[in-house]
Amino acid sequence: IWELKKDVYVVELDWYPDAPGEMVVLTCDTPEEDGITWTLDQSSEVLGSGKTLTIQVKEFGDAGQYTCHKGGEVLSHSLLLLHKKEDGIWSTDILKDQKEPKNKTFLRCEAKNYSGRFTCWWLTTISTDLTFSVKSSRGSSDPQGVTCGAATLSAERVRGDNKEYEYSVECQEDSACPAAEESLPIEVMVDAVHKLKYENYTSSFFIRDIIKPDPPKNLQLKPLKNSRQVEVSWEYPDTWSTPHSYFSLTFCVQVQGKSKREKKDRVFTDKTSATVICRKNASISVRAQDRYYSSSWSEWASVPCS
Amino acid sequence: RNLPVATPDPGMFPCLHHSQNLLRAVSNMLQKARQTLEFYPCTSEEIDHEDITKDKTSTVEACLPLELTKNESCLNSRETSFITNGSCLASRKTSFMMALCLSSIYEDLKMYQVEFKTMNAKLLMDPKRQIFLDQNMLAVIDELMQALNFNSETVPQKSSLEEPDFYKTKIKLCILLHAFRIRAVTIDRVMSYLNAS
């Protein structure tokens, strides 16, 4: 058993049928010695008396808010949560496996640049009695500071019969140098509590590996005289790290016909313009990627050919 | 990236082309190592990230773009000094910091070159003959060093009398390649920045 926060405790249980559970001793936070009784949640049934209460915690029915009283007055509370270990592996019931980029990916994180700011998000089908708390650091043995905000509900989607809820959090490394070569990964830890179930999820990454630039901005077409060709031009996104000559991007320009089956023409360039043939009803899209470290491509920025 | 790229003109800065070749070569070598050594811990998540140039060179600090010198988090240790007379210095206006930066890059390359050559000698003794260093990568390191053209003491190749532990050598190769790839990215960024300046 360990303390999650004041008066909230997590009991770790080896979870299998007929398991013996864990013996837990609760102590009433009071100078009083006599006439103390204990109850669980809203029940008025007295579970025991005295300054300490010994319980055998086996199932969720044994978890909850234990309260010690004296003469009708509440003295203190202890909330017990359960953390299930199933065959040596901590349970992951609360969050959905996003399966991207690989199986058992519960937390996904992205950064728009090298400033040390990043966003993480996760999915769940649970809509109520759910709380998250997020901590982060650079490295784990001698951790350096990363400050995270509160996790917020960022999207709701309907997936078949189920509703899916997306939560996200923004974090910022306290003293980040965009040019630094990372040798210690960022660690992100999310505590999730659903009713009386506690779970924790972690992700470990280098900022360089989670970079996904914003799409190029100010995408424009300039027709070339006496030609079906157009000059496409764009600019680096505002959110990208500067100077751009150091933090360079490479670009992919795509001409896509109206139907998805039509052949896509693609050109790759390090410049912020390209000459392409504009077909009728086609659209031109441009996306960006770090020129020197191949992390994710940005989403497409698009303009119609007409 | 295995995609057709319109290669930019190296312009006035002869080292840019060499640094791009270097990054391509080390990236290919790392990819080959990860595939060949699939039963070894060779992914970024599995290895310890060690920098053999730590406390010996300070390339990131010495080559920091002017725009980032206002960022206190970037100014850890900028007091390293190196020999200065590189042929990549495009004009006499080149600052002392730029010379310091390029000589730091040269020292990095020299250290990695020695490590890679020593490691290759060990790998050639492996009866499994599982993996060797790409000669192209070693050649590209050499070319960039020649382009930088710094006078520097030659570092003798380390020789080891004891029987090599091939498992450890292959893991060390992975560690080295990951670190060198990261340094090659920094070198490419620096060359691109200097070229634009």
Epitope: P17, A19, E59, D87 | -
Partner: antibody
Framework: QVQLVQSGGGVVQPGRSLRLSCAAS????????MHWVRQAPGKGLEWVAF????????YYADSVKGRFTISRDNSKNTLYLQMKSLRAEDTAVYYC????????WGQGTMVTVSS | SYVLTQPPSVSGTPGQRVTISCSGG????????VKWYQQLPGTAPKLLIY???QRPSGVPDRFSGSKSGTSASLAITGVQAEDEADYYC????????????FGTGTKVTVLG
């Protein structure tokens, strides 16, 4: 004490269907994940499928994906395996088992797929 | 389709020490715990070892398990006639959990 009693096995022709049941008692069935494991005659153990305690997630071996469906009825304390498009290679003893460091197995039920 | 490799058979005379190996990889045994089962003919498997080296109550202490890196082993010190059975190791793969990964199985024969 924990008990898992299996039923539903038998002889069936290729391409036909069969449903296996596993009745649980002696524990809070709705709190635990459950597996199906099979063993072809003279062969080793092969995992077939898993279902979470609340039925929210199901996992299948590639060899049965799209043909077999694992399900549970927590009000009846029963686990099911619906097997469709049966093949000769599905012939095996099928076991249900609890998920956890200490597990409990059903007695096994024989499924024979033969024309 | 078996990722955990065991020797097909091992044998020993009563009182001898018999060991069975179970060889896997970094993503299974290297990252997860190992169990061992004993299966007597015509019966369901019986748990012998969980959590690499833990014995459930009721399992004789002549059975012991260990794990090192990407391999595990089961030792029977002082093998007895009633130990003649098939033995299976089991683990998980970090990418496909909760799918059970079973070893190929080992037939233990007690001679004499």
């Amino acid at each position: 004490q924990v008990q898992l009693v299996q039923s539903g096995g038998g002889v069936v022709q290729p391409g036909r269907s069969l449903r296996l049941s596993c009745a649980a008692s002696g524990f809070t069935f709705s709190s635990y994940g459950m597996h199906w494991v099979r063993q072809a005659p003279g062969k080793g153990l092969e995992w077939v499928a898993f279902i979470r305690y609340d039925g929210s997630n199901k996992y299948y071996a590639d060899s049965v994906k799209g043909r077999f469906t694992i399900s549970r009825d927590n009000s009846k304390n029963t686990l099911y395996l619906q097997m469709k498009s049966l093949r000769a290679e599905d012939t095996a003893v099928y076991y249900c088992k609890t998920h956890g460091s200490h597990d409990n197995w059903g007695q096994g039920t024989m499924v024979t797929v033969s024309s | 389709s078996y990722v955990l490799t065991q020797p097909p058979s091992v044998s020993g005379t009563p009182g001898q020490r018999v060991t069975i190996s179970c060889s896997g990889g970094r993503s299974n045994i290297g990252s997860n715990q190992v169990k061992w089962y004993q299966q007597l003919p015509g019966t369901a498997p019986k748990l012998l070892i969980y959590g690499n080296d833990q014995r459930p109550s009721g399992v004789p202490d002549r059975f012991s398990g260990s794990k090192s890196g990407t391999s595990a082993s089961l030792a029977i010190t002082g093998v007895q006639a009633e130990d003649e059975a098939d033995y299976y190791c089991q683990s998980y793969d970090r990418g496909t959990h909760p799918a059970l990964l079973f070893g190929t199985g080992t037939k233990v024969t007690v001679l004499g």
